[in-house]
Interface confidence: low
């Protein structure tokens, strides 16, 4: 009979609001009280096995005790009622679980969408977390008809797809109810015609056709989605070149009504474009479709839009009356070539008389010219036609170049090597920039680029390496030939030298030593040598450091101690740090050169009656590594 509970707790399955107060009552049964000789005074309340302080208890009568909780903040509390029996043994009477949470908030931002070919789906914001099982029900009705409720699934509590087919051109009213053990709330009602909530399927079968007549256009065609029979459409057409990542857009006003084709203009010739299209209800009410599948097309070729960069070099070893000239040019980038370049046409005109035409497949042409002035022209040809001509004056042999650029500067920024100059006063047709890596091991093989005559700052467009010394030459080109070149050295990025200088003694005295070293080869400098530091020490002394200007190749150490072994090394510094060279040792002599004669004979008295000759070895104890 004691398996029957000794009492009970009321309420039995409480759900309470977080941060509210709650009172539970434990009522003992008479038979239990008699058996254990107890009453309500013997009741002990516990939560999650911890005893509740007596101050929270109230004895209602001999059979009942209550406990009160203020500001409940736990989501789940195990509450037990226990009695103290013989000898203070605790006997469990009854237990309940207090579940706490919050009532639902009013659902907000209710909206619906009709994906073409699917049933209407509505979604909403449910508000704060309730910590309780909360049911959301989407309700909908016509003025004359209630539709079946749509109960949101537990794993998607903020949306529901209705079970009825969408009817357009009839208004529907929709709202959401949220309910849990602590309350029930209703969202605002929304009233709309589902035709204004349509998201069409994307246009399909998008294709691209080019035009032989016009190299700047491509015609798009597509099939509209079926919803076209219910609503009028407008479109968003985007395009990009095949290797670009950002899209351009056709102006919306050009595609604001139902159609199944469109001609895109102002495109670049001989360029592959990628297109995509989406659509929505013409008046802008509703949703844009997803993008169509992409489609590619290539515009037709056009004649090259620019003359190639054009320059020349004269072989310094020329025969009497003749000189070898290498004409050279750069391939046009695709956006200027406008097609496949088939060949180049070069004409050479000697002063006042036509000379020669050449058709060349390469980007250089070597010709033998007399010492006269020549004018060279260059055009690039593709399937459609020729570029404008690039014109170069090759002056006569006795031509004196003048008017160089001024204030030439070169500096790195943003991983590029920039070159800047002040323009000469004369009218410059173009500038030629040449650059090469200075090296003791290899000749300076130049790359080059051309800039318009209006430019006075540019960066070198080549694959430049870090810690290499670039010799950069800028030549202004005038109508009558090139101006004087100006050159400057620069580094894309400096590094500490890869080797330090090797120091040696040029001359060693009793109290000073003249040190000398060679300038570091350019291949190991890795930057502009800004200064040297000489470190020297004796075996037992502290090291002394002396800074020396980078223009020097020798330095005199003074205030040295005679007859002493010195260790010396040198470091060279660029803007990015320094590098030590090998250590070198030398010994200062005991006597200066003039002191030898005075010291050679030491008097008898000093030697205790003997005369001793100091050996040369004693005087010149002087060794090099």
């Amino acid at each position: 009979e004691l398996l029957d509970p000794c009492g009970y707790i009321s309420p039995e399955s409480p759900v309470v609001q977080l941060h509210s107060n709650f009172t539970a009552v434990c009522v003992l049964k008479e038979k239990c009280m008699d058996y254990f000789h107890v009453n309500a005074n013997y009741i002990v309340w516990k939560t999650n096995h911890f005893t509740i302080p007596k101050e929270q208890y109230t004895i209602i009568n001999r059979t009942a005790s209550s406990v009160t909780f203020t500001d409940i903040s736990s989501l789940n509390i195990q509450l037990t009622c226990n009695i103290l029996t013989f000898g203070q043994l605790e006997q469990n009477v009854y237990g309940i679980t207090i579940i706490s949470g919050l009532p639902p908030e009013k659902p907000k931002n209710l909206s619906c969408i009709v994906n073409e070919g699917k049933k209407m789906r509505c979604e909403w914001n449910r508000g704060r977390e309730t910590h309780l099982e909360t049911n959301f029900t989407l309700k909908s009705e016509w003025a004359t008809h209630k539709f079946a409720d749509c109960k949101a699934k537990r794993d998607t509590p903020t949306s529901c797809t209705v079970d009825y087919s969408t009817v357009y051109f009839v208004n529907i009213e929709v709202w959401v109810e949220a309910e849990n053990a602590l309350g029930k709330v209703t969202s605002d009602h929304i009233n709309f015609d589902p035709v204004y909530k349509v998201k069409p399927n994307p246009p399909h079968n998008l294709s691209v056709i080019n035009s032989e007549e016009l190299s700047s256009i491509l015609k798009l065609t597509w099939t509209n989605p079926s919803i076209k029979s219910v609503i009028r459409l407008k479109y968003n057409i985007q395009y990009r070149t095949k290797d670009a990542s950002t899209w351009s857009q056709i102006p919306p006003e050009d595609t604001a009504s139902t159609r199944s084709s469109f001609t895109v203009q102002d495109l670049k010739p001989f360029t592959e474009y990628v297109f995509r299209i989406c659509c929505m209800k013409e008046d802008g009410k509703g949703y844009w479709s997803d993008w169509s599948e992409e489609a590619n097309g290539i515009t037709y070729e056009d004649r090259p839009s620019k003359a190639p960069s054009f320059w020349y070099k004269i072989d310094p070893s020329h025969a009497q009356g003749y000189r070898t000239v290498q004409l050279m040019w750069k391939t046009l980038p695709p956006f200027e070539a406008n097609g496949k370049i088939l060949d180049y046409e070069v004409t050479l005109t000697r002063w006042k008389s036509h000379l020669q035409n050449y058709t060349v497949n390469d980007t250089k042409l070597t010709v033998n010219l007399t010492n006269d002035r020549y004018v060279a022209t260059l055009t690039a040809r593709n399937l459609v036609g020729k570029s404008d001509a690039a014109v170069l004056t090759i002056p006569a042999c006795d031509f004196q170049a003048t008017h160089p650029v001024m204030d030439l500067k070169a500096f790195p920024k943003d991983n590029m090597l920039w070159v800047e100059w002040t323009t000469p006063r004369e009218s410059v047709k173009k500038y030629i920039l040449e650059w090469c890596v200075l090296s003791d091991k290899a000749p300076c093989i130049a790359d080059w680029q051309q800039e318009d005559g209006t430019v006075h700052r540019t960066h070198l467009r080549g694959n430049l390496a870090e810690s290499k010394c670039y010799l950069i030459t800028v030549t202004p080109v005038y109508a009558d030939g090139p101006g004087s070149p100006e050159s400057i050295k620069a580094y894309l990025k400096q590094a500490p030298p890869s080797k330090g200088p090797t120091v040696r003694t040029k001359k060693v005295g009793k109290n000073e030593a003249v040190l000398e070293w060679d300038q570091l080869p350019v291949d190991v400098q890795n930057g502009f040598i800004r200064n040297y530091t000489i470190f020297y020490r004796t075996i037992i002394g502290n090291e002394t450091a002396v800074n020396v200007d980078s223009s020097h190749t020798e330095y005199t150490l003074s205030s040295l101690t005679s007859d002493t072994l010195y260790m010396v090394r040198m470091a060279a510094y660029t803007d990015e740090g320094g590098k030590d060279g090998p250590e070198f040792t030398f010994t200062t002599p005991k006597f200066a050169q003039g002191e030898i004669e005075e010291q050679k004979l030491i008097s008898e008295e000093d030697l205790g009656g003997e005369q001793k000759l100091i050996s040369e070895e004693d005087l010149h104890h002087h060794h090099h590594h």
């Epitope: 800047e420 002040t422 803007d575 990015e576």
Partner: antibody
Framework: EVQLVESGGGLVQPGGSLRLSCAAS????????MNWVRQAPGKGLEWVSH????????YYADSVKGRFTISRDNAKNSLFLQMNSLRAEDTAIYYC??????????????WGQGTTVTVSS | DIQMTQSPSSLSASVGDRVTITCRAS??????LNWYQQKPGKAPKLLIY???SLQSGVPSRFSGSGSGTDFTLTISSLQPEDFATYYC??????????FGQGTRLEIK
Amino acid sequence: EVQLVESGGGLVQPGGSLRLSCAASGLTFSSYEMNWVRQAPGKGLEWVSHISSAGSTKYYADSVKGRFTISRDNAKNSLFLQMNSLRAEDTAIYYCAGYNYAYYYFGVDVWGQGTTVTVSS
Amino acid sequence: DIQMTQSPSSLSASVGDRVTITCRASQSISSYLNWYQQKPGKAPKLLIYAASSLQSGVPSRFSGSGSGTDFTLTISSLQPEDFATYYCQQSYSTPPITFGQGTRLEIK
């Protein structure tokens, strides 16, 4: 992240001294030409002093010449301004600011948040 | 030393306006002119370098032009966050770094 953080500002009496420090991080400090620039309350920016990247060359505005000394410790990524014989007109926010020696044409692109110096009796 | 003169010294404008600030150098400084923006309690921030190059991270509504002695900073469509003080600075002959006296741009 490139950062310059000034410290050492405070209230000082006329004729007194202060030493401002600027700690650099996130940049190759030894490649930066550094400056102190100040801004008096409600006024514009006034250049105070400059030190070359290696610390060998120093320049001062006429208004502080002989009273202020700029220095740097590249090993510790630090810049300093020793201010002696302070006057009321030296009251300002002092910014340390720099540029990579190679990018000098491209403006002072690194600034500290400033430290306030008040000279008042 | 090269002197820099800004005009106007203050200017009232509304969001969406096009605003122009000018800076004149006492001698030719080629295109070595930089513009800074300073908001109250903050350090100056480099906006434009070399007269017309936009510093990384600066919105494209800011632009600069000019060379020699006359330079212009233009904000094509003023945004609320653009109300601040603007300074020009020459880097043709430095040190000293010389700034203009500043142009305070405030909401009309």
